[in-house]
Interface confidence: low
Amino acid sequence: AQGKEVVLLDFAAAGGELGWLTHPYGKGWDLMQNIMNDMPIYMYSVCNVMSGDQDNWLRTNWVYRGEAERIFIELKFTVRDCNSFPGGASSCKETFNLYYAESDLDYGTNFQKRLFTKIDTIAPDEITVSSDFEARHVKLNVEERSVGPLTRKGFYLAFQDIGACVALLSVRVYYKKCPELLQGLAHFPETIAGSDAPSLATVAGTCVDHAVVPPGGEEPRMHCAVDGEWLVPIGQCLCQAGYEKVEDACQACSPGFFKFEASESPCLECPEHTLPSPEGATSCECEEGFFRAPQDPASMPCTRPPSAPHYLTAVGMGAKVELRWTPPQDSGGREDIVYSVTCEQCWPESGECGPCEASVRYSEPPHGLTRTSVTVSDLEPHMNYTFTVEARNGVSGLVTSRSFRTASVSINQTEPPKVRLEGRSTTSLSVSWSIPPPQQSRVWKYEVTYRKKGDSNSYNVRRTEGFSVTLDDLAPDTTYLVQVQALTQEGQGAGSKVHEFQTLSPEGSGNLAV
């Protein structure tokens, strides 16, 4: 930020009424008045170029220092070319000297050269030649010097002429401040610039209203340089929750908007399914029936539990059931839908029911399912099963109601036996089978049906209580169709697949396991 100048003395602005001291009086510097831009302007001038040994002094009034440590002196002046004067005026000079003296009191008209310290010799960049002077095109020079540190209550400046033709149009003395500043939503107070060039004054900033230092962030600080410039900003403030940055201030979020944390972000419009927020809201409340899960960001629309799975089918296959369903028609506005399957079995005779999770087997864990189908096996025959599929999402836990659909299925058959060929010969086939253990108690016999492949007119049946049988008196090198079926008190169970097994040819021998 640009330095602020605090003016201590401005000759040009004073309209010639400062009454500076001249020494010697009336013989050197004197106050002149001219019109520039339709206004009177004043200047102190001296032009004793034809006389040698000039030592003319012009002293300002006493200037109160106040809080200044380093002062800056800006001079605007003209210097006429010595060649403008006859013979070049051998004693003519084209420079003058600038001095200062500090004091705790005003000496009035008591002028003592010895109290003054030279600041510099002031030389013009451009001199006004005779033709320019006659055409009123004077060359105005601007020079600036600085002095510091100052320690007394006030000071004087003085100008020494040693034989030049000078007009001093403006003398402006000022000191510099780093101006009051708002940066990074922090307020930095007006600060006096230091007097030593290398030093930078560290200044702490304060967050503007409704702004805070973010957690873990640095407190705002800036450095005030000698020239009144703010440098090296450190840290910042952010608008607190419920407020957003508007220019250099934090403004409350408008109704219908919110901001949930201190950040650089603007306020956001309240998401869907929220109630209109008041001014300065940090969040937007959900509409009735809508919820926000703990992990949901405040910017996310409020959501609700899903409706029940849209369509549920249970297809029985022996002692297995395949459950299939379609997603809920209303997802509740969320994508984190999962399904849970529960099972209840009922005895047809008594109507007694109970959970069956322990006795059945699911193709995948029945809770937290993301797919829309599951196979349930190891079901007992001649039982009624009711399956419940519940749809849940991230906000289902926030309500007591559940969204589910049920499907019932009666298991009238055992699961088909799984059949294996244990061994064979030229005239026999050894066959075994298995069914799930829960169903075995309901089977009293197994019926094995077999026939030659291609012969649909005749077949043979063998019954056994065991889990294997050897079929004898078979033709060599012949394929037989074999099926095993469980028999229960209630009738026939499900039959196995029809398997093709072939006896060995006469060249082969022995009982070979397959």
Epitope: G16, E17, I35, D38, M39
Partner: antibody
Framework: QVQLVQSGGGLVQPGGSLRLSCAAS????????MHWVRQAPGKGLEWVSV????????YYADSVKGRFTISRDNSKNTLYLQMNSLRAEDTAVYYC?????????????WGQGTLVTVSS | SSELTQPPSVSVAPGQTVTITCQGD??????ASWYQQKPGTAPKLLIY???NRPSGVPDRFSGSSSGTSASLTITGAQAEDEADYYC????????????FGGGTKLTVL
């Protein structure tokens, strides 16, 4: 309404004195430089004097220097011209005028004029 | 002090264009102002600066300047424009005076 209303003119003997007044209204009087301009019968306009807005700077035409004094009372919004040692050649209509910009004009507001006759 | 010189009189037919001139060294440095004065009344500002008209001044009045000369031009003169016209300028001689020209009597025939 911006206006300048003059008073104080009349007949005066040579060597005598007269004080002209110019009352301003409708504008911030203390912000403007004010002038007196005169016009001898059948002649052109002649600038007489100027006073700065605060009253701390005054200038005069050589023809009146040392005899006329321009002054102003910003608290009364009034401009004055004190004329001493009057001569026959001072006979004229005297106008007060406002300098619209800076010290020297242009003169955008004029008084109605007041006749000063110096005669024995 | 500087002097500004104007022709004592000019005339113009109604509806015609007329130019009144003003000569003086001070015009090298400063623009002229122009005033109209009708008999028995105070002067009225017509033109100031480069060519500026106060509100209420008809646009048939215009000003220009070049070197040591300034001009007031009336384009399409009207009977009510018959009056005395004065130029005025700051004095460039450094004596802090403002000077008037001698005035020009405009007659609309």
């Amino acid at each position: 309404q911006v206006q300048l209303v003059q008073s104080g003119g009349g007949l005066v003997q040579p060597g005598g004195s007269l004080r002209l007044s110019c009352a301003a209204s409708g504008f911030t009087f203390s912000s403007y430089a004010m002038h007196w301009v005169r016009q001898a019968p059948g002649k052109g306009l002649e600038w007489v004097s100027v006073i700065s807005p605060a009253g701390n700077n005054t200038y005069y035409a050589d023809s009146v220097k040392g005899r006329f004094t321009i002054s102003r009372d910003n608290s009364k919004n009034t401009l004055y011209l004190q004329m001493n040692s009057l001569r026959a050649e001072d006979t004229a209509v005297y106008y007060c005028a406002r300098a619209s910009v800076g010290a020297t004009g242009p003169f955008d507001i004029w008084g109605q004029g007041t006749l000063v006759t110096v005669s024995s | 002090s500087s002097e500004l010189t104007q022709p004592p009189s000019v005339s113009v037919a109604p509806g015609q264009t007329v130019t009144i001139t003003c000569q003086g060294d001070s015009l090298r440095s400063y623009y002229a102002s122009w005033y109209q004065q009708k008999p028995g009344t105070a002067p009225k500002l017509l033109i100031y600066g480069e060519n500026n008209r106060p509100s209420g001044v008809p646009d048939r009045f215009s000003g220009s300047s070049s070197g040591t000369s300034a001009s007031l031009t009336i384009t399409g003169a009207q009977a009510e424009d018959e009056a005395d016209y004065y130029c005025n300028s700051r004095d460039s001689s450094g004596t802090h005076l403002t000077v008037f020209g001698g005035g020009t009597k405009l007659t609309v025939l």
